[in-house]
């Protein structure tokens, strides 16, 4: 009668350098096992409604689930189950071949710090205190944490704030970047991907909220000091940021080698692998360290661009120096060059 | 603070059924997956139903085809319809849900008082 809902179920996240995504490994009465996506009678491809894994991501001290499918960059340990009945029950589950395992990925959001809620109702007595100034980021549906539209609250009003693009403002970024806990600011949003077209549909919570802000001073150091409330403008930009902490992050993994620490790279754009095709903007090894890091890798012994003499080879661009900071991969349709990284295998 | 008040249980005969409610307040900005447990006497609690926030639901065997989970997203409420039942269903339970406080919180845990059900036969 075991499942992941059950209080005192056990589960870890392994081969990433995160506690909140990567492979999952299940504990029973026998010791740890990965878990086979083709369990509960899914297909080895099929994604699910993440959300059915809150109570996984909870014990692990993470957000709310972003994904649950497969993890592809399978690594099988000794032991691998497939599991039988309902999504998530452990009940009914047998040891499967290795090479027949394609393991389970669930990728948790890396949680804010905040403290944790008190579960002693305050006294009837005491009134209610004015909520301090807070910010938002309202993210397109489906969209990532840290990237959106800015909303600032002040007492119980709250909107968008109005941005012209001439508006030198990199200080103020950084300040609502880190104010947020999402880092450092990387770059303004347009607004068809920040989210700013509603779908009538949507929940009365991400409606436009009816104040709107004017930035008042770029170099403020609290958040009262940088807004001004205007009247509604039909038209215009509202600021829309992307700051450094956005989740997800840039998936990748290494193919075609002897182990998981060697091989082409490729990323991930949405459920879709493609090559990571090599950029003369961000030739130093520290690309590939992170893309080590990610397998669970040690640093890299070497990296080669293979020569790109096909000019129908396709695969994915990322302008930036780290593939952390890529917000988005750019296609590039013909002439990719391919990189063959060899990392450190921490069990050779 | 978070609160998960349970209403609806009672006593009830063999073959009868009870709806459970169960109400969430409090500061929360999202919740993810929605439960209900059960304790019998000197048994350790046991997952009843689940519905996560996609609509997904998980049922204990021995509640399958008798009992059904629903919920209200707008109202932060959570029922459990249960019909058929039987004297082994009797136990207190318990409400139970995984909120973040803000966008991006971590996902924190409450549970209700719980609400005893008694079916005899």
């Known amino acids: 009668r075991l499942s992941w809902y059950d209080p005192d179920f056990q589960a870890r996240l392994t081969r990433s350098n995160s506690k909140c995504q990567g492979q999952l490994e299940v504990y029973l009465k026998d010791g740890w096992h990965m878990v086979c996506s083709q369990s509960w009678g899914r297909s080895s491809k099929q994604w699910e409604d993440p959300s059915q894994a809150s109570k996984v991501c909870q014990r692990l001290n993470c957000g709310v689930p972003l994904s649950l499918g497969p993890f592809l960059v399978t690594y099988t340990p000794q032991s691998s189950i497939i599991c039988y009945g309902q999504l998530g029950s452990f009940s009914n589950c047998s040891h499967s071949r290795n090479d027949m395992c394609h393991s389970l990925g669930l990728t948790c959001l890396e949680p804010q710090k905040t403290t944790p809620p008190t579960t002693r109702p305050p006294p009837t007595t005491t009134p209610e205190p004015t909520a301090p100034p807070r910010l938002q980021l309202v993210a397109q549906s489906g969209g990532q944490h840290c990237a959106g539209v800015v909303e600032f609250y002040s007492g119980s009003l709250g909107g968008t704030i109005s941005y012209e693009a001439q508006d030198k403002t990199q200080d103020l970024e950084n300040f609502l970047c880190n104010n947020l806990q999402c880092g450092s600011f990387l770059k303004h949003l347009p607004e068809t991907e920040a989210g700013r077209a509603q779908d009538p549909g949507e929940p009365r919570e991400h409606q436009p909220l009816p104040i709107q802000w004017k930035i008042q001073n770029s170099s403020c150091t609290s958040l009262e000091h940088c807004f001004r409330k205007i009247k509604p403008q039909k038209s215009g930009r509202v600021l829309a940021l992307l700051c450094s902490g956005f989740q997800p992050k840039v998936q990748s993994r290494l193919v075609g080698g002897s182990s998981i620490c060697e091989g082409t790279v490729e990323v991930r754009q949405g459920a879709q692998w493609a090559a990571l095709c090599d950029s003369s903007s961000a030739r130093s090894s520290l690309r590939w360290e992170e893309v080590c890091r990610e397998q669970q890798c040690g640093s890299v012994n070497s990296y080669r661009v293979l020569d790109a003499g096909d000019p129908t080879s396709r695969g994915l661009f990322c302008p930036h120096q780290k593939l952390s900071q890529c917000h988005e991969l750019w296609e590039r349709n013909s002439y990719c060059k391919k990189v063959f990284v060899t990392c450190q295998d921490p069990n050779p | 603070q978070v609160q998960l008040v349970e209403s609806g249980g009672g006593l009830v005969q063999a073959g009868g059924s009870l709806r459970l409610s169960c109400a969430a307040s409090?500061?929360?900005?999202?919740?993810?997956?929605m439960g209900w447990y059960r304790q019998a006497p000197g048994k350790e609690r046991e997952t009843v139903a689940v519905?996560?926030?996609?609509?997904?639901?998980y049922y204990a065997d021995s509640v399958k085809g008798r009992f059904t989970i629903s919920r209200d997203n707008a109202k932060n409420t959570l029922y459990l319809q249960m019909n058929s039942l039987k004297p082994e269903d009797t136990a207190v339970y318990y409400c139970n849900a995984d909120f973040e406080t803000a966008s991006g919180s971590p996902l924190y845990e409450s549970w209700g008082q719980g609400t005893q059900v008694t079916v005899s036969s």
């Open positions: 519905i996560s926030s996609g609509g997904s639901t």
């Open positions: 409090g500061s929360i900005f999202s919740i993810s997956v």
